[in-house]
Interface confidence: low
C-alpha cells in the first residue's frame, strides 16, 4: 500500500484513479470501514466519520477518472489507512501525520536551550534531522535538543521527518535574543566625547524591558551603576543616571550612550544588561573604554593609557618626520629631554593604530 506523510495543520490529497477516464461511483472509507465521502449520482456525499467537515474531493477531476480525497487541517489522529473503492477494486493509502513544535517560546535568549518535540502517530518510528540557519545539523528521535543557542542560530530551522523512505519538511522560525556583539572596545584621547552603541541582533514588533550599565573603572575598587533605563515599544527612557559621569542616552534603538568626555578615571569595563518583558534571563554586552593622555612636564614627555588593554598592544612615542621612537608593551612610555617638534603617541596592535594623540614640544631657551 502507498504511504503518504502529512503535516499537522496542513492539507493533504490522497489520490485514487479509475482505469476508465470517466465519472463513476467511488467511496473513501477509513480502516473501520466507516464511509468518509463518495459519489451518489452527480453529488458528493459525506458519511458519519469524524473527517466529514474536513474532507473534500476535486469534482473537476472526476470526469478524468481521478477521485482524490482532500483532508484539511490535519490532526495526528487522522493517521490511518484509508480505502478508496472504485470499479470493484480497493486502493489502500496509509496516511501518517506528524507535528513538530518548539517546547517553549521561539524567541529565546542566547545561551538558553531549545527543544523541538515531534508528535507522531502510534506505531510509527520516525527519525528527525534539523538544520540550523548557520548550517548546524542535529539529529534525533521524538525530541531534538540544542543546549546553548548562539546568535547564528537565529532564523529558519529546517527539519526533515523521515518514515518508510518518505519525508516531510517542517520550517520553524527561531529568534535568538542577543546583542550583535558580545564585546566591544572604544579607544579615545582624554577629553574626547565617547559614543557607546549596543545594536540588537534581532527585531521584535514590540520591545519592552529595562536595562542597566554597570561600570568597573580601572582605578575604582568596586563597580557602580552608571545608568538605568526602561524600554517601552522601542522607546528608551532614562530612569536613573550617576552625577559623575553624567551619561546621555538616545531615545530610540539601537541603545546609544554618550559620555561627554573620556577621562582616565572613567577608563575600564562596563556590562550592559537588558531584561526583556516576559523573558527569563538577561541580554549582556561588555564594553571597554581605553583612554590616552600625552603630557609634558618639565623635561619629561609622557604618554599613558588607562583601561583594559591586551599585553600584546604597543605604546610608542614618535617624533614626527624623525626616527626618534620609544616603544613598549606597557601602559606608559616617556622620553626625557625630548627634542622640539610634534610628537605622536600611538597605541597599536600588530601594526594597526588603535589610538593616536599629538603633543607639541616647544624648544626651551
Amino acid at each position: 500500500k502507498k504511504v503518504v506523510l502529512g503535516k499537522k495543520g496542513d492539507t493533504v490529497e490522497l489520490t485514487c484513479n479509475a482505469s476508465q477516464k470517466k465519472n463513476t461511483q467511488f467511496h473513501w472509507k477509513n480502516s473501520n470501514q466507516i464511509k468518509i465521502l463518495g459519489i451518489q449520482g452527480l453529488f458528493l456525499t459525506k458519511g458519519p466519520s469524524k473527517l466529514s467537515d474536513r474532507a473534500d474531493s476535486r469534482k473537476s477531476l472526476w470526469d478524468q477518472g481521478c477521485f482524490s480525497m482532500i483532508i484539511k487541517n490535519l490532526k495526528i489522529e487522522d493517521s490511518d489507512t484509508y480505502i478508496c473503492e472504485v470499479e470493484n477494486k480497493k486502493e489502500e493509502v496509509e496516511l501518517l501525520v506528524f507535528g513538530l513544535t518548539a517546547n517553549s517560546d521561539t524567541h529565546l535568549l542566547e545561551g538558553q536551550s531549545l527543544t523541538l518535540t515531534l508528535e507522531s502517530p502510534p506505531g510509527s518510528s520516525p527519525s528527525v534531522k534539523c538544520r540550523s540557519p548557520g548550517g548546524k545539523n542535529i539529529q534525533g528521535g521524538r525530541t531534538i535538543s540544542v543546549p546553548q543557542l548562539e546568535r547564528q542560530d537565529s532564523g529558519t530551522w529546517t527539519c526533515t521527518v523521515s518514515q518508510d523512505q518518505k519525508t516531510v519538511e517542517f520550517k520553524i522560525d527561531i529568534v535568538v535574543l542577543a546583542f550583535q556583539k558580545a564585546s566591544s572596545t572604544v579607544y579615545k584621547k582624554e577629553g574626547e566625547q565617547v559614543e557607546f552603541s549596543f545594536p540588537l541582533a534581532f527585531t521584535l514588533e514590540k520591545l519592552t524591558g529595562s536595562g542597566e550599565l554597570w561600570w568597573q573603572a580601572e582605578r575604582a575598587s568596586s563597580s557602580k551603576s552608571w545608568i538605568t533605563f526602561d524600554l517601552k515599544n522601542k522607546e528608551v527612557s532614562v530612569k536613573r543616571v550617576t552625577q559623575d559621569p553624567k551619561l546621555q542616552m538616545g531615545k530610540k534603538l539601537p541603545l546609544h550612550l554618550t559620555l561627554p568626555q573620556a577621562l582616565p578615571q572613567y577608563a575600564g569595563s562596563g556590562n550592559l544588561t537588558l531584561a526583556l518583558e516576559a523573558k527569563t534571563g538577561k541580554l549582556h554586552q561588555e564594553v571597554n573604554l581605553v583612554v590616552m593622555r600625552a603630557t609634558q612636564f618639565q623635561e619629561n614627555l609622557t604618554c599613558e593609557v588607562w583601561g583594559p588593554t591586551s599585553p600584546k598592544l604597543t605604546l610608542s612615542l614618535k617624533l614626527e618626520n624623525k626616527g626618534a621612537t620609544v616603544s613598549k608593551q606597557a601602559k606608559a612610555v616617556w622620553v626625557l629631554n625630548p627634542e622640539a617638534g610634534m610628537w605622536q603617541c600611538l597605541l597599536s596592535d600588530s601594526g594597526q593604530v588603535l589610538l593616536e594623540s599629538n603633543i607639541k614640544v616647544v624648544p626651551t631657551w
Partner: antibody
C-alpha cells in the same frame, strides 16, 4: 595597512589539486571569520567557503563540498583553500575576503585575487 | 538555498543621474544584505552592509534600503568613477549568495 594577499594559483589538469594561500596583515586575523569567493571568466561572483575565527566551523557551497577544504593557521595569519578533483568549471579568479564581525556585515576587506585555470 | 534576483542586469546612465538597483530574496532575510562595487580586473569593494549602513570611506551618494525580501542600492548623482558592476550579497545563512550583478555603463 589592512591587507590580504592570495597566492598559489596556476594551471592544473582536470582531476588535479592545488592549494591556495592568503596572507593577512594589519588586523587581528584570529578575530575574524574568513571567506573564499571566486569569479569565473566573464561571470559574476560566487561565494565558495568560509571558516570561523578558531577554525571550528566551516561552510561550503554545494558544488565544492567534498572536494575543497578551507583551513587557517592563526599563528601564521594565513588562510588556505585545498582544492582536489578539480574540474574545468572551477576555473576562476579566487579571492580571499574578511567576513564582517557578524551576520549582515558583509566582506569588508578583499585580496587582489589569484587565477586558477583547470584545463587539459 | 535562498535565491537572490538582481535587476536590471545592465543599465546605461549619464553623469549626474540618479540610479537604483534592486535585489529580491526568495524568502525573508532580515537586513543581512550587502552591496559591492567591482571594476574590471579589480577585487570587489564593500559599499553598504546590513542593507542600509554605509561602509567607512564610501561616498554618501551611495545609499541602501530595504529589509525582509526587497532591497535597493541608490546612487544619488552618478560620478565618472561609479561606472562599474554592482552585486548584492546575502550573508544571512549558508550558502552565502550573490546577485547576478548589474553592469552600469555610460550612456
Amino acid at each position: 595597512e589592512v591587507q590580504l594577499v592570495e597566492s598559489g594559483g596556476g594551471l592544473v589538469q582536470p582531476g588535479g589539486s592545488l592549494r591556495l594561500s592568503c596572507a593577512a596583515s594589519g588586523f587581528t586575523f584570529s578575530s575574524y571569520w574568513m571567506s573564499w569567493v571566486r569569479q569565473a571568466p566573464g561571470k559574476g561572483l560566487e561565494w565558495v567557503a568560509n571558516i570561523k575565527e578558531d577554525g571550528s566551523e566551516k561552510y561550503y557551497v554545494d558544488s565544492v563540498k567534498g572536494r575543497f577544504t578551507i583551513s587557517r593557521d592563526n599563528a601564521k595569519n594565513s588562510l588556505y583553500l585545498q582544492m582536489n578533483s578539480l574540474r574545468a568549471e572551477d576555473t576562476a579568479v579566487y579571492y580571499c575576503a574578511r567576513d564582517g564581525s557578524y551576520s549582515g556585515y558583509g566582506m569588508d576587506v578583499w585580496g587582489q585575487g589569484t587565477t586558477v585555470t583547470v584545463s587539459s | 538555498a535562498i535565491q537572490m534576483t538582481q535587476s536590471p542586469s545592465s543599465l546605461s546612465a549619464s553623469v549626474g543621474d540618479r540610479v537604483t538597483i534592486t535585489c529580491r530574496a526568495s524568502q525573508g532575510i532580515r537586513n543581512d544584505l550587502g552591496w559591492y562595487q567591482q571594476k574590471p580586473g579589480k577585487a570587489p569593494k564593500l559599499l553598504i552592509y546590513a542593507a542600509s549602513s554605509l561602509q567607512s570611506g564610501v561616498p554618501s551618494r551611495f545609499s541602501g534600503r530595504g529589509s525582509g525580501t526587497d532591497f535597493a542600492l541608490t546612487i544619488s548623482s552618478l560620478q565618472p568613477e561609479d561606472f562599474a558592476t554592482y552585486y548584492c550579497l546575502l550573508d544571512y545563512n549558508y550558502p552565502y549568495t550573490f546577485g547576478q550583478g548589474t553592469r552600469l555603463e555610460i550612456k
